[in-house]
Amino acid sequence: GITSINCSGDMWVEPGEIFQMGMNVSIYCQEALKHCRPRNLYFYKNGFKEEFDITRINRTTARIWYKGFSEPHAYMHCTAECPGHFQETLICGKDISSGHPPDAPSNLTCVIYEYSGNMTCTWNTGKPTYIDTKYIVHVKSLETEEEQQYLASSYVKISTDSLQGSRKYLVWVQAVNSLGMENSQQLHVHLDDIVIPSASIISRAETTNDTVPKTIVYWKSKTMIEKVFCEMRYKTTTNQTWSVKEFDANFTYVQQSEFYLEPDSKYVFQVRCQETGKRNWQPWSSPFVHQTSQETGKRNWQPWSSPFVHQTSQTVSQVTAKSSHEPQKMEMLSATIFRGHPASGNHQDIG
């Protein structure tokens, strides 16, 4: 664009150099050239000469009119055709921008990933604004009334060191640009309620050689949180339907979960946890793929007999994945949990 141009006159824009996309726009060019009575005044947009909707207002001034201007950015300049000059003479130039006022930020969420030392807040920014837009996160202590403000884009990480004076906060996000300003809804945050346990990892799996083979999945977390509630989901790589098992976990030792699975099949497992009774889940762990052993003996496999795990605190349910494409990319799949019965065609996110 044009940042520093020596003008021999003036150029101005109505309603302004930044305006709402789709508005009608008038751009004026006024020459103040020495030794020139311009025969014509010309407008250029992004270097291309404009042909239409140009009005000569008087000897020194012309206007170009755009109906429903919808380009996010353009640079305009105007020139004069001076008698006796072979080339056109530059008068002035301007960068112009069109866009939208910001939407109110929505779906504000704040979490503390265990050991991160930060409170991470995220939100949806809404539709693109096309112009320079800032997001300011306000964090106000409900105990001391002290307020801090942080510059952000679509998320912010705030050091928990700066949140030492209090446990309860009010958090909101302000979106601002030259066309408007909007605030998100306020979020009440208690620091003790938003901790997400350290990542859970499936380390290995093995299938025993018993008469009725069972698969044992080993998984762990470095969390220091005592009461943790977890879900493990599993399915064959050819299947769309997840089975989900829930249980309470104690990570002072490696967790073992036992499954009776279809033989000679490739299964994928994922686990996620949350502090018991809290709202925020870990993301699902990386997919762990395990091949069960080939069936031995004459035992008939009956998939309805028991796809369950021998563990006291457990529920198994089924969920249906969004897509059967690319089964190797399991982290892209998501589903809705239906407790205790198969999913029936409802495909919302769980993660």
């Epitope: 960068d95 320079d132 403000q149 884009s153 912010v156 990480k157």
Partner: nanobody, 127 residues
């Protein structure tokens, strides 16, 4: 290189008003973060008020909310701080600061985030 020059400081009785000005020059095009900061003897420099020239939002430190107002005059390239209901504890050297691009995650009232500074103007409030 951005240059900032404050003026308008002085002595005033508690409950009185002052208006500080900050004349800015040497700007390149684009929007800036601009603000007022202050430092009392023996204390750390603290944020008073800031704004971003690309929008209409203003931001204030807790101790001055409702009493001070930050504003700007685009055509004169000047930043103002209107200070009403002044208190003895408002006594300090007041500085104007600017930065074209605060880092993401910056506390926008934290002095260390700002690149360009004026020399300051003294405000003394007596009882």
């Amino acid at each position: 290189q951005v240059q900032l020059q404050e003026s308008g400081g002085g002595s005033v009785q508690a409950g009185g008003s002052l208006r500080l000005s900050c004349a800015a020059s040497g700007y390149t095009s684009g929007n800036y973060w601009m603000g007022w900061f202050r430092q009392a003897p023996g204390k750390e420099r603290e944020g008073v008020a800031t704004l971003w020239t690309g929008g209409a939002s203003t931001f204030y430190g807790d101790s001055v909310k409702g009493r001070f107002t930050i504003s700007r005059d685009n055509f004169k390239n000047t930043l103002y701080l209107q200070m009403n209901s002044l208190k003895v504890e408002d006594t300090a050297m007041y500085y104007c600061a600017a930065d074209p691009a605060l880092r993401l995650g910056a506390n926008i009232l934290r002095p260390a985030e700002y690149k360009y500074w004026g020399q300051g103007t003294q405000v003394t409030v007596s009882s």
